[in-house]
């Protein structure tokens, strides 16, 4: 068996310093959560304690805050590309600046795989977006591989401002194909990484043939097995369980949102790429967590603009 | 056991060429990133080159930086250094190293026993 | 680049011994930092990464700590097999630069 540990966010919605637990800002620091900086504590924490370790986000980092309104994303590119994401789907918020709002701060600054198997450039943007984003990425992990498939709410061109020469297909219909690439490929574990909502992703898990796990976002769905740690109210238990029209059983999980909680789980992986067990939680990142010093130092770098701007 | 052997030098005139070899068994070889590093007779440790996992991006120094290329095979589980218009200051222990399995910079967790290279007239 | 500076680069220490190197990066470097032990004619060794991991195998008695640009590297109780040559290594970004190295050697 070979056991895999997924970290993921979603939704982060430019939350790059610490806030109040109902993720407004921060008025009492030692009450405070959340934050890139205290994100890279744990994630190193658990980088360090376990071998097998992803870093996934589920899309809609961008607007939010006085940060993206500043800094019109090259900020998720350098914090993420600091943390040391693996990889990111798109979310419709990437597309609020238009696609080139997406283009020149985070898709051509990021150091790690963008995602969106059902989005499709047309005309003159073709060319222009080629192998910027990709449908998925084979990422190896350790001795083993592991696929991740993109995908993105088909409701985005309502939602945001991806312009006319970008189509979103429908999700399940854009992803069984490339996940059929991956098994070409003897790629037997494969994580479905969205942002579509909650109910699509228990689709995604049910109707996708060789998807293995599925990390979702666009609904701030907050899962948690026993007593949750906050104020936010489970919608089911983490992960949560879909059998898969061929029978399987596959996690599908979320992490709220506002970089409140990291996403924690671990699945344990038979030598075929079967999903043998699942179990995690989200971690609350409260103040018993340190903002990673280094990181901090960085945020206030950048803060310097944002106190000027606000002035 | 995972295991990287260098293989490859030798005394060579400066402006002349060398190709050294490693290669790498006990682990999957085409998942990691891997680099080569050099030490110069009684001096310190040089990072000289990276190739990524998949080939798709190679970096080096200033100072090999248009005079030495980094490759791999991976269907043979071999990196190779071809260095060209060698000086006396190449002159150095080269090993070979193992990375990480990503696109970002890392540390070095194997090492092989090093290939020296001498170059003198 | 960023530079890499050790210090002392060279100190004499008994079997026992609680021995500190540090390594100063010139500029933060968050914790990606390495620490190897060389021996003379032999491959280096990894003990320590991310700043302060230590590496499978590698005893107890080493220990890293350090953020950003300030880091140090601790052997609790030098034992004989512990004289060699420490470098650090920054991982944060390309070129990869390592420390001019510190001899730990016998009083």
């Known amino acids: 068996a070979w056991e895999l540990t997924i970290l993921h966010t979603n939704d982060v919605h430019s939350r790059l310093e610490q806030t109040s637990e109902d993720s407004s800002k921060c008025v009492n620091a030692s009450r405070c959560m959340g934050g890139v900086a205290r994100l890279f504590t744990k994630v190193q924490q658990i980088r360090r304690a376990e071998p097998n370790v992803l870093l996934l986000d589920a899309g809609d980092q961008y607007q939010g805050t006085i940060w993206f309104t500043v800094y019109k994303g090259a900020e998720v590119a350098h914090f993420m590309n600091a943390l040391r994401y693996d990889a990111m789907a798109l979310g419709n918020h990437e597309f609020d600046n238009g696609v080139e709002g997406l283009i020149e701060p985070l898709l051509k600054e990021a150091k790690f795989p963008i995602l969106s198997a059902n989005i499709k450039a047309k005309g003159p943007l073709a060319s222009q977006i080629s192998g910027l984003y990709l449908p998925y990425k084979v990422l190896p992990v350790g001795d083993e591989v592991v696929g991740i498939v993109g995908y993105t709410s088909k409701e985005t061109p309502f939602l945001s401002n991806p312009g006319t020469n970008l189509v979103f297909e429908d999700e399940i219909t854009a992803l069984q194909p490339e996940v059929d690439k991956l098994k070409t490929l003897n790629v037997n574990k494969i994580i479905a990484l969205g942002h579509s909502g909650f109910e699509m992703d228990k689709l995604i898990a049910q109707k996708v043939r060789g998807v293995d796990v599925v990390v979702g976002g666009h609904s701030n769905t907050f899962l948690y097995t026993g007593n949750p740690p906050s104020k936010e109210v489970p919608a089911g238990k983490y992960p949560f369980i879909v059998t898969s029209d061929d029978g399987r059983k596959v996690p599908v999980v979320q992490a709220y949102a506002f970089g409140k909680y990291l996403g924690y789980l671990k699945i344990e992986f038979d030598e075929r790429g079967n999903v043998i067990s699942s179990h995690g939680n989200p971690i609350l990142l409260n103040s018993s967590i340190p903002e990673d010093p280094s990181i901090k130092a960085d945020i206030n770098k950048w803060r310097i603009k944002l106190d000027n701007y606000s002035t | 056991q995972v295991q990287l052997v260098e293989s490859g030098g030798g005394v060579v005139q400066p402006g002349r060429s060398l190709r050294l070899s490693c290669a790498a068994s006990?682990?999957?070889?085409?998942?990691?990133?891997m680099h080569w590093v050099r030490q110069a007779p009684g001096k310190g440790l040089e990072w000289v080159a990276v190739i990524l996992y998949d080939g798709s991006n190679k970096y080096y120094p200033d100072s090999v930086k248009g005079r030495f290329t980094i490759s791999r095979d991976n269907s043979k589980n071999t990196l190779y250094l071809q260095m060209n218009s060698l000086r006396a200051e190449d002159t150095a222990v080269y090993y070979c190293?193992?990375?990480?399995?990503?696109?970002?910079?890392?540390?070095?967790?194997?090492w092989g026993q090093g290939t020296m290279v001498t170059v003198s007239s | 680049d960023i530079q890499m500076t050790q210090s002392p680069s060279s100190l004499s220490a008994s079997v026992g011994d609680r021995v500190t190197i540090t390594c100063r990066a010139s500029q933060g470097i968050s914790s990606w930092l390495a620490w190897y032990q060389q021996k003379p004619e032999k491959a280096p060794k990894s003990l320590i990464y991310a700043a302060s991991s230590l590496q499978s195998g590698v005893p107890s008695r080493f220990s890293g700590s350090g953020s950003g640009t300030d880091f140090t590297l601790t052997i609790s109780s030098l034992q004989p097999e512990d004289f060699a040559t420490y470098y650090c290594q920054q991982y944060n970004s390309y070129p990869l630069t390592f420390g001019g190295g510190t001899k730990v050697e016998i009083k």
């Open positions: 190293a193992r990375g990480g399995s990503s696109w970002y910079p890392d540390s070095f967790d194997i």
């Open positions: 006990g682990f999957t070889f085409s998942n990691y990133g």
